[in-house]
């Protein structure tokens, strides 16, 4: 009869156990909803702000065609300005055409004058070829106009209405590039 | 937080292949481009491949036509193809997400290129 008792009892003890952990793992689960909760309407916010807003491009940038430009207000060197851009969800200018190279070199006339401006062209250590950041070859008439007397790694910038090379470790300012949203109107 | 959780790293022959994979879970809404590093022994981190949220890729320059970065935006994740690997490659592989706040990185993976 003791022995019944106490099986009774062991058997009741670690159905509590198991209850307990129910309850934790619901108040566990109970938190990491209300913290995704909290997450979804941060995000929903962000969305409707952005809808509300719906400028193809965001404060700051300027627009041409299907392109967003943003121009720098720091100096940094050619990685560093590589990541700022990426933070922002962009890269570093990748100019395609003459006329975006005019668009480009008439905007910073109006903006800040004859500056140094990091893009996104980099010269090959071994080839000596330059590319693009996505792989690609510039056009003919879109080559850095001097070649660099360097060591190290050599990197495109855009300066009055050129296209130039220099040590990537200088320090200048630098233009980042997105696509613009399209409007859904 | 976002946290970055890389696989795919191990050992290859020279000339060989590799897709690394870097899973993303958490504030992932916060991210505006993803990207992988490396780090070779007693040498410093340095950026491989990235891929804007708008799909736009740029690359190192000793990776270029080697390496292809790609992402699945419905598994939150970002591969890294790795073609005509070279021991020059091996290094531990670190994901890397960009925010307009802080930057956050996965553990990382090894690849060793050696025959």
């Known amino acids: 009869k003791l022995l019944q008792v106490s099986t009774i009892a062991m058997q009741q003890q670690e159905k509590l156990i198991q209850q307990e952990r129910a309850l934790l793992n619901f108040t566990e689960w109970k938190r990491s909803c209300a913290l995704q909760m909290k997450y979804c309407q941060a995000f929903m916010q962000n969305s409707l702000s952005s809808a509300h807003n719906s400028s193809p491009c965001p404060n700051n940038w300027i627009q041409n065609r299907e392109s967003c430009y943003y121009v720098s207000e720091i100096w940094s060197i050619w990685h560093t300005s590589q990541e700022n851009c990426l933070k922002e969800g962009s890269t570093l200018l990748q100019i395609e055409s003459k006329e975006e190279m005019d668009f480009i070199t008439g905007s910073l006339r109006k903006i800040k004058g004859s500056y140094d401006y990091w893009v996104g062209l980099s010269q090959d250590g071994h080839s000596g070829r330059w590319l693009w950041q996505d792989g690609s070859s510039p056009s003919p008439g879109l080559l850095p106009a001097e070649r660099s007397q360097s060591a190290n790694q050599v990197c495109g910038y855009v300066k009055s209405n050129s296209l130039l090379s220099s040590n990537c470790s200088t320090w200048k300012y630098f233009i980042c590039e997105k696509y613009a949203l399209r409007s859904s109107v | 937080d976002v946290q970055l959780v890389e696989s795919g790293g191990g050992l290859v022959q020279p000339g060989g292949s590799l897709r690394l994979s870097c899973a993303a879970s958490g504030r992932i809404f916060s991210v505006n481009a993803m990207g992988w590093y490396r780090q070779a022994p007693g040498k410093q981190r340095e950026l491989v491949a990235a891929?804007?949220?708008?799909?736009?890729?740029t690359y190192a320059d000793s990776v270029k036509g080697r390496f292809t970065i790609s992402r699945d935006n419905s598994k939150n994740t970002v591969y890294l193809q790795m073609n005509s690997l070279r021991p020059e490659d091996t290094a531990v592989y670190y994901c890397k997400a960009f925010t307009r706040g802080d930057d956050y990185w996965g553990q990382g993976t090894l690849v060793t290129v050696s025959s």
């Open positions: 891929i804007t949220n708008q799909g736009a890729p």
